[in-house]
């Protein structure tokens, strides 16, 4: 039975330009994490396999980093960026568990509007 | 002025597909993403999903994933969303509203009122 | 899916009466930078609704200054300082920090 919960940074709302950090943590099981992959929509961005370490995807080098931890850095947001990010844990026995973060990437004008936040 | 105009209410039969659409002015429509609300009964608010005009991506309620499909035409900057295979379930009081995380859902449609019945 | 639970469902009220309602998330609803995705909305009958509060207190342009709302986490609230006719109607709060995003059930700002 799958137990585990995944817990996510939550939605991200960040202005162009910017950089931001997306995590996941999965917790309440036992189950080992064999690799997280990291995907937007249909895209796969990045792979953190445990005895692999790290991929990139090539589309993706010049912007995505590794880390912190089995997190993922995004750089040089553009508003293209927008759109729902999932992190897919494979865990051993217990199977798949997935994740969902929205990133919204905003016009410098727009986010203007947002002033009193704290926008990454 | 920013101002979100929907189609008209719409009479379905049981088992057709629809569409709704929600025509954008007064603002760049790529800037902000277009959300879809439910209102059921007269009371119950339910998120269905959002588009960013900007790139076309998506985020569903998973509750509607396979009812709901969303889409824009930038060159018309109107959103649009299609309901699949309705049922008697599925009327309600649709809007359309813009927004971000940020400000919450600061401009409404006017709402379209589906009625499924045979 | 995040649980929103709205208190209270149904609020008699009379004018001049100063009221709050209460919205409580079943996880924090700050995300990793501290920013919390929380707005208030006013639903009228025969109209869309309308926007109150963003952003737990911000006050969205052209709304009134009885109406205001703190909290953090997962708890918060919404204040209406003396209630005025136009204020009657279904209140709602929002939670936009976590996918999918979720509405409270509502509650009814009705006359005693």
């Known amino acids: 039975m799958m137990t585990g919960t995944i817990e996510t940074t939550g939605n991200i709302s960040a202005e162009k330009g910017g950089s931001i950090i997306l995590q996941c943590h999965l917790s309440s099981t036992t189950a080992q994490v064999t690799q997280v992959n990291w995907e937007q929509q249909d895209q796969l961005l990045a792979i953190c396999n445990a005895d692999l370490g790290w991929h990139i995807s090539p589309s993706f080098k010049d912007r995505v980093a590794p880390g912190p931890g089995l997190g993922l850095t995004l750089q040089s947001l553009t508003v293209n960026d927008t759109g729902e990010y999932f992190c897919i844990y494979h865990t051993y026995p217990d199977g798949t568990y997935t994740g969902r973060i929205f990133l919204e990437v905003l016009e410098s004008s727009v986010a203007e509007h947002g002033a009193r936040f704290q926008i990454p | 002025e920013v101002q979100l105009q929907q189609s008209g209410p719409e009479l379905v039969k049981p088992g057709a597909s629809m569409k709704i659409s929600c025509k954008a002015s007064?603002?760049?429509?790529?800037?902000?993403?277009m959300n879809w609300v439910k209102q059921s009964h007269g009371k119950n608010l339910e998120w269905i999903g959002l588009?960013?005009?900007?790139?076309?991506?998506?985020s569903y309620n998973q509750k509607f994933k396979g009812k709901a499909t969303l889409t824009v035409d930038k060159s018309s900057n109107t959103a649009y969303m299609d309901l699949l295979s309705l049922t008697s379930e599925d009327s309600a009081v649709y809007y359309c509203?813009?927004?971000?995380?940020?400000?919450?859902?600061?401009?409404w449609g006017q709402g379209t009122l589906v009625t499924v019945s045979a | 899916d995040v649980v929103v639970t709205q208190t209270p469902l149904s609020l008699p009220v009379s004018f001049g009466d100063q009221v709050s309602i209460s919205c409580r998330s079943s996880?924090?609803?700050?995300?990793?930078?501290?920013?919390?995705?929380l707005s208030w909305y006013l639903h009228k009958p025969g109209q869309s609704p309308q926007l109150l509060i963003y952003?737990?207190?911000n006050r969205f342009s052209g709304v009134p200054d009885r109406f205001s709302g703190s909290g953090s986490g997962t708890d918060f609230t919404l204040k209406i300082s003396t209630i005025k006719p136009e204020d009657l109607g279904l209140y709602y709060c929002?939670?936009?920090?976590?996918?999918?995003?979720?509405f409270g059930a509502g509650t009814k700002l009705e006359l005693k």
């Open positions: 007064g603002f760049s429509f790529p800037g902000y993403t």
């Open positions: 509203t813009r927004g971000t995380l940020i400000t919450g859902f600061a401009y």
């Open positions: 929002l939670q936009g920090t976590h996918l999918p995003l979720t």
């Open positions: 588009i960013n005009p900007y790139n076309g991506a998506t």
């Open positions: 996880q924090s609803l700050a995300n990793s930078y501290g920013n919390t995705y």
């Open positions: 952003g737990i207190s």
